[in-house]
Every structure is written in structure tokens, then in C-alpha cells.
Interface confidence: low
């Protein structure tokens, strides 16, 4: 996170840190006590599938607390869409081996109807994204969790007011524009499969998974969020489906 | 809609404004009121606007110059009360009012929903934690706002 | 018209179920409303018992929490009471009754059935 | 649990008097509250929703007033058929409760 702040601890209940072989990989988002969203592209170049390990409740990895989580990854799911490399359709839900227990630093968000998500929530403006990702474009990685409050734009916005770049990936319906353009504040590399959390009346809800950019804060550029809205009906059908054999599940979008 | 009027001074009137054209002035010799005599003028010198009972729905109806306005039953709204307010009431309407998730329903009005581990409170609208640690809240915020001391 | 009919046993004895069903007609159970169930143990006052909403979630008085389940069967245009583990002070006229549950009207309950009277005793 | 408390208990008033039942709220309820009348051996029938919103087909003579805590039900001039058991109601959080009614009876 470039330009955040500390997210007090507990504050962020919902974080996942996703490590591979003990080694910092992506974000995630716990769901419910079983289930954590993350990012597809996070997955792209793992080989020992087994040694992925999802923690809940951390705060400040230099140190252990007593509030943390750590329960083996049974299965990542990613829709036959995405393809590795690119950009459209980043999305893995992941299967925890076993649930999680909840407690005051480790809690769901909410995964919104979609209907609430499209009409309600994505015309809530400011929203939080967070993780341990880097603190500067090439810089180093956050010991404590970060947190930043981004504004969302309308597709149409974030292109006339981006800076065209040859090879940009295209901005589809499956993604949504967030951020600042000016350089100061963004997520970055190590936040991708983080939440964007948006908040109404209340509650805290997932809107959005931290996915990819131009470089980080750079100037005349957004950062750019899994649109999980196209996602709901994808997720809860897995979720309610008998578990399949394999760690790895390319399921059917839509 | 001003019948009223007529029967305050109906010998007069009948002489004055009805079988000849009188002024502004004559009809407050009449009326010895300014009040009633606006109404009255109102509706005189440019016709009554309530006379095609334009206001719906029981509404009431007010002359006005060249124009008339409606006071609505508390259930309707708009310029000639058409509108019912529940209609108004749907989901795409700040979210038909619910604090989570709203239905329309064809014939019917919208309805409110919540998320598991909440159930909706009995204003139909907000939803309450029915689970201690209900998705979407930060407990240790929700504890420390619970314990701050109330003003008074 | 909306009416509402309660029908069930009139005597049940203590430690047993008390079972009741509210037949609903001139209204379909799925539409909309909150459906429920309200008591009225003799020469005293009203007590609600809980109710179901349309879409199938259920809430009860804390009081009675543990021992109340109250079900609906569309089919049938139906929903139903039971109390478990009733004693004598379970003995009351129980009335199904029902609020339409809209923005602006909180639990009014417009509609009720006539009542029917419970008596636990062995 | 939000208790009602109504009073009083019991009004003993001649057809034609007003009639004024009072309901106080143990915490504020806004104007979540509604009144019912009661005759005996029948379902209780809404009177009033809202604390002040007449309910269909029930005649002018009963209004209701209030907010927060203290809410009154008015019955303009009494007729005969008035005298019956008034209950108010909690509407607006879990559990709804029942004030333990007010019984109107002809003096």
C-alpha cells in the first residue's frame, strides 16, 4: 500500500495473508469460516500446492501475538475464464483445510447479493483496500498491515482520465477503476488479492480484490479491482457444491 | 371551489361582479377584507384552476394565478398527488430504505433482507447481529463505541 | 379478504408439544408480511411469541427461544406453532396474526385470527 | 426488552366524556407504537399505527399522539361500543412487546 496508514490492529479483521513455502505470496479475504477470496494471477507460478498456508488475524509480521490463524489451503478455484498472465477474470476462492475459529481479530466481510453490489454499493465512493504489499513502486513490503481509502470511478472516467499506454490491458465489465492518478496513494504489488471493502449503513462489504496497474502510484494511472459483483453467483454456487479432489480447480464461469 | 365566497354577500356580488365586470377594488368594497378578497379575485379574473378537480387521490385543491396547487393525502405525492409513495418505495431508491438487501416485488411493495447472522429488526428495515460475530463488523470497534460514555 | 384460522389440539398435557396451525386465505403466504403467533394467557395480557417472515427467517422472544419453532408449508398456504415442554402456564388463547412488514409499518398487526383456546393440565 | 407501562389500569368514564390512555415507553422508541382495541371474547383489533396514523375504517374519534417514551391514545367523545380493554405496542425492536392494557368501563 503506497500513501496508507496503519490498519490499527483488529481493524481489519477480514485481512488474509497468503504465504507459499513460509514466503509472503498475495492478500486474500475471508468470507466465512471456510472460505477466502484472493486473487487468480497470485497463483500463476506456484508448483508445491501443498505449502500454501492462509493466516488469519495477523497484524505485524515481525512478531507473533497470540491472535493469528494459520490453516493449510485445501483447494484454489479459478474460473476456466482467466488466463494466467493476464488480467480479466482474477479471482481464486480458496478452501481452508479446516474452518477458522472467529474471534475478535478474525471475522468475515460480507460477500453482498449482487443485486445490492451493482445498484447500491458501487455508487458508495470512498472504500478501504489493505495489505502487507509494498509501501513504494519497487519498494520494500509492509511489516504491518496498511490500509487506504480509495474512491471508485465510473470505467468511462478512469479511461478518459488515464494516460494511454500502448500495451494497457483493456479495462472490461469484470474490473472497476479505484485510486488516485496523481503518484500519492495506491495499492501495490504484495496487496494483490486483498480486499476492497466498502462500507454501508454499518456494515463492511467485498467489492472489490486488489488485482493490477500500471506500476504503482504512477502518475496518470488507477489502481485496478476484480469487479466481484460478476462473481457472487460463481462463488456461492462452489461454495455450496461437494468439495473435488485436486488443489487446484479450473470451474466453469459463468 | 370558492363557493364560500358566494355566500358571504350574495346580493352584492351578484350585482357587482357577476352581472357586470367590477374591479379589484369594487370586490374589496364588497369582501371588506383583503384576504378574501384576493382568493376571491384570484379565481374571478382568470377562472378557477381547481374546477377541472386536477388534484388526484383526495387530494385538495387551491386556486392559484393561472396556476393551483394540491395538498395530498399523506399516502401521495407529486403536482396532482398521482403519485403514490410507495410506489416511490423500491429498490433502486436508496436502496428502498433497507440497511441491507431489498426485493421489489411485482403488485406488492419492496420488502428488506439480511445478510445471514442478522435478522431483520421490527422497523422492516434494519437488521440487527443474531451470531456474535456477524460478517462485515469490526468487533473491537463495535465494543469500544458501545462502551463510550452517552452525552446528556 | 385476508383471514386468518388457528386450529390445534385444546388440551395438551404439561412436558408435551403444543402444536397449532394458521391456515391463511384471500392472501398468498409468500408474498410478503411477517407471520405470527401471539398469546394471551387468561385475564392477562398480550404476549408475542415470534414470528416468520415470508422469505423463511424465523424470530422469537427471547423468553420462549428455546422452546418455540415456528415453520411454514407455501403448499398449503400455511404456518405453524409448536412449544415444547409446556406447562400450565402455557395455557392461553393463541391468535396467528399478520403485519405487513414494509418500510412504515413496523409490526402493526393488521390482521388476526379469532383465537384459539390452549389449556395445559394433565 | 423495551417495557411498556400504560395507565391507568382501569378508566371508568360515561358516553360522550373524552377518554385519554396513556403508554410510556422504558426507552425511546421513536414513533414505532401502536394501539389496539380489545372486546371480550375477541381478536384484538389496530386501532392506531405509528403512534398516530388511524388505521382503515376506524372512526375519527380515536387519535394517538406522542414520541420517544410517552405516547396517549384520545378517544374524542366516547360511544358505547368504545368500552373495551387498550392495549399499545412496541414496534420497533425485538422482542415486540404489549403494554399490560388499559380497561375502559362505563361508569
Known amino acids: 500500500i503506497v500513501g496508507g496508514k496503519v490498519c490499527p490492529k483488529g481493524e481489519c479483521p477480514w485481512q488474509v495473508l497468503l504465504l507459499v513455502n513460509g514466503a509472503q505470496l498475495c492478500g486474500g479475504t475471508l468470507i466465512n469460516t471456510i472460505w477466502v477470496v484472493s486473487a487468480a494471477h497470485c497463483f500463476d507460478k506456484i508448483k508445491n500446492w501443498r505449502n500454501l498456508i492462509a493466516v488469519l488475524g495477523e497484524h505485524d509480521l515481525s512478531e507473533h501475538d497470540g491472535d493469528e490463524q494459520s490453516r493449510r489451503v485445501a483447494q484454489v478455484i479459478i474460473p476456466s475464464t482467466y488466463v494466467p498472465g493476464t488480467t480479466n477474470h482474477d479471482i481464486a476462492l480458496l478452501r481452508l483445510h479446516q474452518p477458522v475459529v472467529l474471534t475478535d481479530h478474525v471475522v468475515p466481510l460480507c460477500l453482498p447479493e449482487r443485486t445490492f453490489s451493482e445498484r447500491t454499493l458501487a455508487f458508495v465512493r470512498f472504500s478501504l483496500v489493505s495489505g502487507w504489499g509494498q509501501l513504494l513502486d519497487r519498494g520494500a513490503t509492509a511489516l504491518e498491515l496498511m490500509v487506504l481509502n480509495v474512491p471508485r470511478l465510473m470505467t468511462q472516467d478512469c479511461l478518459q482520465q488515464s494516460r494511454k499506454v500502448g500495451d494497457s490491458p483493456n479495462i472490461t465489465e469484470y474490473m472497476f477503476c479505484a485510486g488516485y492518478s496523481d503518484g500519492s496513494k495506491d495499492s501495490c504489488k504484495g496487496d494483490s488479492g486483498g480486499p476492497h471493502a466498502t462500507h454501508y449503513r454499518g456494515t463492511w462489504y467485498l467489492t472489490g480484490i486488489v488485482s493490477w496497474g500500471q506500476g504503482c502510484a504512477t502518475v496518470g494511472h488507477f489502481g485496478v479491482y476484480t469487479r466481484v459483483s460478476q462473481y457472487i453467483e460463481w462463488l456461492q454456487k462452489l461454495m455450496r457444491s461437494e468439495p473435488r479432489p485436486g488443489v487446484l480447480l479450473r470451474a466453469p464461469f459463468p | 371551489a370558492n363557493a364560500f365566497l358566494e355566500e358571504l354577500r350574495p346580493g352584492s356580488l351578484e350585482r357587482e361582479c357577476k352581472e357586470e365586470q367590477c374591479s379589484f377594488e369594487e370586490a374589496r368594497e364588497i369582501f371588506k377584507d383583503a384576504e378574501r378578497t384576493k382568493l376571491f379575485w384570484i379565481s374571478y379574473s382568470d377562472g378557477d384552476q381547481c374546477a377541472s378537480s386536477p388534484c388526484q387521490n383526495g387530494g385538495s385543491c387551491k386556486d392559484q394565478l393561472q396556476s393551483y396547487i394540491c395538498f395530498c393525502l399523506p399516502a401521495f405525492e407529486g403536482r396532482n398527488c398521482e403519485t403514490h409513495k410507495d410506489d416511490q418505495l423500491i429498490c433502486v431508491n436508496e436502496n428502498g430504505g433497507c440497511e441491507q438487501y431489498c426485493s421489489d416485488h411485482t403488485g406488492t411493495k419492496r420488502s428488506c433482507r439480511c445478510h445471514e447472522g442478522y435478522s431483520l429488526l421490527a422497523d422492516g428495515v434494519s437488521c440487527t447481529p443474531t451470531v456474535e460475530y456477524p460478517c462485515g463488523k469490526i468487533p473491537i470497534l463495535e465494543k469500544r463505541n458501545a462502551s463510550k460514555p452517552q452525552g446528556r | 379478504q385476508v383471514q386468518l384460522q388457528e386450529s390445534g389440539p385444546g388440551l395438551v398435557k404439561p412436558s408435551q408439544t403444543l402444536s397449532l396451525t394458521c391456515t391463511v386465505s384471500?392472501?398468498?403466504?409468500?408474498?410478503?408480511?411477517?407471520w405470527s403467533w401471539i398469546r394471551q394467557p387468561p385475564g392477562k395480557g398480550l404476549e408475542w411469541i415470534g414470528y416468520?417472515?415470508?422469505?423463511?427467517?424465523?424470530n422469537y422472544n427471547p423468553s420462549l427461544k428455546s422452546r418455540v419453532t415456528i415453520s411454514v408449508d407455501t403448499s398449503k398456504n400455511q404456518f405453524s406453532l409448536k412449544l415444547s415442554s409446556v406447562t400450565a402456564a402455557d395455557t392461553a388463547v393463541y391468535y396467528c396474526?399478520?403485519?405487513?412488514?414494509?418500510?412504515?409499518?413496523?409490526?402493526?398487526?393488521?390482521?388476526w385470527g379469532q383465537g384459539t383456546s390452549v389449556t395445559v393440565s394433565s | 426488552e423495551i417495557v411498556l407501562t400504560q395507565s391507568p389500569a382501569t378508566l371508568s368514564l360515561s358516553p360522550g366524556e373524552r377518554a385519554t390512555l396513556s403508554c410510556r415507553a422504558s426507552?425511546?422508541?421513536?414513533?414505532?407504537l401502536h394501539w389496539y382495541q380489545q372486546k371480550p371474547g375477541e381478536a384484538p383489533r389496530l386501532l392506531i399505527k405509528?403512534?398516530?396514523q388511524p388505521a382503515t375504517g376506524i372512526p375519527a374519534r380515536f387519535s394517538g399522539s406522542g414520541s420517544g417514551t410517552d405516547f396517549t391514545l384520545t378517544i374524542s367523545s366516547l360511544e358505547p361500543e368504545d368500552f373495551a380493554v387498550y392495549y399499545c405496542?412496541?414496534?420497533?425492536?425485538?422482542?415486540?412487546?404489549f403494554g399490560q392494557g388499559t380497561k375502559l368501563e362505563i361508569k
Open positions: 396474526a399478520r403485519s405487513v412488514n414494509y418500510y412504515g409499518n413496523s409490526f402493526a398487526v393488521g390482521y
Open positions: 384471500g392472501y398468498s403466504i409468500s408474498s410478503d408480511s411477517a
Open positions: 416468520i417472515y415470508y422469505s423463511g427467517s424465523t
Open positions: 426507552q425511546g422508541i421513536s414513533d414505532y
Open positions: 405509528y403512534t398516530s
Open positions: 405496542q412496541n414496534g420497533h425492536s425485538f422482542p415486540l412487546t
